[in-house]
Interface confidence: medium
């Protein structure tokens, strides 16, 4: 299937859903957007870490997830098709597209995706033997916490990182990849 | 920086193959698409086709769907595109550009076919 | 597939001018249409996108316009490192194509 065929037949499922199944993605959506603005109100950054973390240049870098290379896959030829559309635009329309394709055309994203973590994680089990370097250290508020509160912390720290890099890679695109 | 290096030339013999190769730094090569473009002696350019490394997701040129192959090893950030059975006429300089706007270019490799 | 065509395969110009390339398509493409120089030396850069969009660090002297069928790259101020084949290329259908090439030499 070529791209356009497949871009007519993602906006032809939209086109011919009916408002019942698209209000179940706009209830979710509307709802995801409420619990974000009920806890925003409340959330209170702790003491002492307003500053930015220091990111180590060096740490092996979070790897994209599925959904993050099917979007790098398709955003070309969506800018291509619509250099018009703005940022969010092209990616809703993404969102749409990975949201109507198949199990099976998933797997080839979530196979290499699943990869990449491997790999990823060796490499970070790898970094971490090493030991963080001093700079990295100097970023460390308590030293003396336990394992698995250093463990939990690593995992939050992942997360983070992941959504930071997507964003910079998003910009970089941005900048990149303007010539679409 | 953005970098594409290709593979140097190369001179073979009718009805053999080639695999010529595109090393690339400065970008994640992942998540970008390579493009493959073909220059005979004096021509112009004509474009053979693109992948895209993070699924292997190809288009091909239909004049090349029988002649050339394209692969990338994401470990190494290289793309690749291998020749078959090769006659006079894939006597060629073999560009790989990146992105479907092609923004960043290799040098070139020169493939030679003659006996 | 869309064919690209660029009438005048070579310019001849002077420091200075004001040169126009031109580029035709087999059925309109709806302003998809790159730009690219060739130098002499074999070396390929991308110039300008969706018709008329400068790619990063291009010099403003580059110019593009054109809609349909009807294309044009120009340079308002000829310098001696313009000296070189200009293509065009359409993105508006696979397989992307393109133009023949139009070489730029100095009177």
């Known amino acids: 299937v070529n791209f356009s065929e497949f871009s007519k037949k993602c906006s032809e499922r939209w086109k011919t859903m009916s408002a019942k199944e698209k209000g179940k993605f706009e209830d979710m959506a509307k709802a995801d957007k409420a619990r974000y603005e009920r806890e925003m109100k409340t959330y209170i950054p702790p003491k002492g870490e307003t500053k930015k973390k220091f990111k180590d240049p060096n740490a092996p870098k979070r790897p994209p997830s599925a959904f993050f290379l099917f979007c790098s896959e398709y955003r070309p030829k969506i800018k291509g098709e619509h250099p018009g559309l703005s940022i969010g635009d092209v990616a809703k329309k993404l969102g749409e597209m990975w949201n109507n394709t198949a199990a099976d055309d998933k797997q080839p994203y979530e196979k290499k995706a699943a990869k990449l973590k491997e790999k990823y994680e060796k490499d970070i089990a790898a970094y971490r033997a090493k030991g963080k370097p001093d700079a990295a250290k100097k970023g460390v508020v308590k030293a003396e916490k336990s394992k698995k509160k250093k463990e939990e912390e690593d995992d939050e720290e992942d997360e983070e990182d992941e959504e930071e890099e997507e964003e910079e890679e998003d910009e970089d695109e941005e900048e990149d990849d303007d010539d679409e | 920086q953005v970098q594409l290096q290709q593979s140097g030339p190369e001179l073979v013999r009718p009805g053999t193959s080639v695999k010529i190769s595109c090393k690339t730094s400065?970008?994640?090569?992942?998540?970008?698409?390579m493009n493959w473009v073909k220059q005979r002696p004096g021509q112009g350019l004509e474009w053979i086709g693109q992948?895209?490394?993070?699924?292997?997701?190809?288009y091909y040129n239909e004049m090349f769907k029988d002649k050339a192959t394209l692969t990338v090893d994401t470990s190494s950030s290289t793309a690749y595109i291998h020749l078959s059975s090769l006659t006079s006429e894939d006597t060629a300089v073999y560009f790989c550009a990146r992105e479907d706007s092609m923004d960043y270019w290799g040098q070139g490799t020169s493939v030679t076919v003659s006996s | 597939d869309i064919q690209m065509t660029q009438t005048t395969s070579s310019l001849s110009a002077s420091l200075g001018d004001r040169v126009t390339v031109s580029c035709s398509a087999s059925r309109g493409i709806n302003n998809y249409l790159n730009w690219y120089q060739q130098k002499p030396d074999g070396t390929v850069k991308f110039l300008i996108y969706?018709?008329?969009s400068l790619h990063s660090g291009v010099p403003s002297r580059f110019s593009g316009s054109g809609s349909g069928t009807d294309y044009s790259l120009t340079i308002s101020n000829l310098e001696p490192e313009d000296i070189a084949t200009y293509y065009c290329?359409?993105?508006?259908?696979?397989?992307?194509?393109f133009g023949g090439g139009t070489k730029l030499e100095f009177k």
């Open positions: 969706y018709t008329s």
């Open positions: 400065g970008y994640t090569f992942l998540t970008y698409w």
């Open positions: 290329q359409q993105y508006s259908k696979l397989p992307w194509t």
């Open positions: 992948i895209f490394p993070a699924s292997d997701n190809t």
